[in-house]
């Protein structure tokens, strides 16, 4: 069980990253979908190697102060969402803007019906072009 | 099987990184092999995971204004080569030059004969110090 | 054979990283344990995926030249310590301090009782808040 | 929006040289093979040259071997096509073609084009 999606941009407000199965993605079998072009869902319990890189371009001055997060959560079956991994990195001085790469990764019990998805700060500042971002997982 | 390769400084000016089976490296057997010392070879088709880290060192003054970017790319068989992953990281305004690591990595389906290399904007601005910059997979 | 553990804040001077089994962590079986709150160690020999991810904030002007390091390092029973990834970050320039996360992550051949831990430069930097830090392994 | 913008064009005297420029935008040129493609009046689409994603394999019809030079700069987005001893033969309107990724190598498969530069070689 294995996925690997790319990121796509997206007109909406929220800060859940969008994903597609485009360009190299991989999808290995049904026990695992990628949910509204949101949330990898598993069908099996297990442990699972969760991972996703975000790639952003921000400038200190046009940015808020706090730094850019990129977030990778969970959300369980009747229980609230919860936080896994997450990483920060400070805006950039380069003009317009500066990019900035980082990547998520960790070993998770995940719960028949549990999706994870990734949440940043500002997706207005994630870089979409080939490779840039992306995310997935597998089973161990 | 898997594979885990150390950098190698070269004196070629192809943007290729090259690796070594050298220190603390991984050949678990012939089933992957390192070609060229530039490129992880493998004989069997399947999914497996894919990573790399490089450690770089540039100054905003002395270098291009694009950002250093690493890319791991991917040749098959009877294709032309393709970008996997990208990571990019604007350039340090600390001197003579700012250290930063960019670590690469997901799940990708290979065909038996193909081969994954790592690519970056300034091979001469690559960290080769123990454990700086590296490159592997294993086959789930 | 897997394990996730959360970094721990700690009075204690050494560079070497405290971790604990909190929040949402992974211990697979005792055939992985954490030793002292500072290493993972192994019972059965073979090929492991280790990780680490360290997320610091810094300034420029308060730290020393040389820039934030996170070293994963392997303690092999009767052996010396040895260095098996680094990455390193230039200190920021924002204020107070600038975060910034660093991702480490390799296949490496572990010796029954062998024990992996993270050093870094400055352990009073790194960030403790939930998900930023933390340290893993799989056995493949 | 993808777009690819030939330039470089013009009348050249036979045995001549021309360089071929193509400004691409609106999609990661690194990712990409791209080619030259030309059409002589009157007659159908010949490919010229095809260059790898990351400039380290090019490919070329017999026609054209050993006189023209496909390039790329990923760092400008630009793709080139050095023509020299040039031949009554060669003219023609030349397009710049983006490839899709994946395909083949020895696939003619194109899903963007430029709008074209005319070449005349004449005395």
């Known amino acids: 069980i294995a996925a690997h999606v790319i990121s796509e941009a997206s007109s909406k407000t929220t800060s859940v990253l969008q994903w597609a199965e485009k360009g190299y993605y991989t999808m290995s079998n049904n026990l695992v979908t990628l949910e509204n072009g949101k949330q990898l869902t598993v069908k099996r319990q297990g442990l699972y190697y969760i991972y996703a890189q975000v790639t952003f371009c921000s400038n200190r001055e046009a940015s808020s102060q706090a730094p850019f997060i990129a977030s990778l959560c969970l959300k369980s079956p009747g229980r609230f969402e919860r936080i896994l991994l997450r990483a920060a990195n400070t805006h950039s001085s380069a003009k317009p803007c500066g990019q900035q790469s980082i990547h998520l990764g960790g070993v998770f019990e995940l719960q028949p019906g549990a999706s994870v998805f990734v949440n940043v700060t500002d997706p207005s500042q994630v870089s979409h072009g080939t490779g840039f971002t992306s995310f997935g997982l597998l089973k161990l | 099987i898997a594979a885990h390769v150390i950098s190698e400084a070269s004196s070629k000016t192809t943007s290729v990184l090259q690796w070594a089976e050298k220190g603390y490296y991984t050949m678990s057997n012939n089933l992957v092999t390192l070609e060229n010392g530039k490129q992880l070879t493998v004989k069997r088709q399947g999914l497996y995971y894919i990573y790399a880290q490089v450690t770089f060192c540039s100054n905003r003054e002395a270098s291009s204004q694009a950002p250093f970017i690493a890319s791991l790319c991917l040749k098959s068989p009877g294709r032309f080569e393709r970008i996997l992953l990208r990571a990019a990281n604007t350039h340090s305004s600390a001197k003579p030059c700012g250290q930063q690591s960019i670590h690469l990595g997901g799940v990708f389906e290979l065909q038996p004969g193909a081969s994954v290399f790592v690519n970056v904007t300034d091979p001469s601005q690559v960290s080769h110090g123990t454990g700086f910059t590296s490159f592997g997979l294993l086959k789930l | 054979i897997a394990a996730h553990v959360i970094s721990e804040a700690s009075s204690k001077t050494t560079s070497v990283l405290q971790w604990a089994e909190k929040g949402y962590y992974t211990m697979s079986n005792n055939l992985v344990t954490l030793e002292n709150g500072k290493q993972l160690t192994v019972k059965r020999q073979g090929l492991y995926y280790i990780y680490a991810q360290v997320t610091f904030c810094s300034n420029r002007e308060a730290s020393s030249q040389a820039p934030f390091i996170a070293s994963l390092c392997l303690k092999s029973p009767g052996r010396f310590e040895r260095i098996l990834l680094r990455a390193a970050n230039t200190h920021s320039s924002a204020k107070p301090c600038g975060q910034q996360s660093i991702h480490l992550g390799g296949v490496f051949e572990l010796q029954p009782g062998a024990s992996v831990f993270v050093n870094v430069t400055d352990p009073s930097q790194v960030s403790h808040g939930t998900g930023f830090t933390s340290f893993g392994l799989l056995k493949l | 929006e993808v777009q690819l913008l030939e330039s470089g064009g013009g009348l050249v005297q036979p045995g001549g040289s021309l360089r071929l420029s193509c400004a691409a935008s609106?999609?990661?040129?690194?990712?990409?093979?791209m080619a030259w493609v030309r059409q002589a009046p009157g007659k159908g689409l010949e490919w010229v040259s095809t260059?790898?994603?990351?400039?380290?394999?090019?490919y070329y019809a017999d026609s054209v071997k050993g006189r023209f030079t496909i390039s790329r700069d990923n760092s400008k987005n630009t793709l080139y096509l050095q023509m020299n001893s040039l031949r009554a033969e060669d003219t023609a309107v030349y397009y710049c073609a983006k490839r899709p990724e994946g395909l083949q190598i020895d696939s003619q498969n194109f899903d963007y084009w430029g709008q074209g530069t005319l070449v005349t070689v004449s005395s």
């Open positions: 260059i790898a994603p990351l400039g380290g394999n090019t």
């Open positions: 609106g999609f990661t040129f690194v990712a990409y093979p």
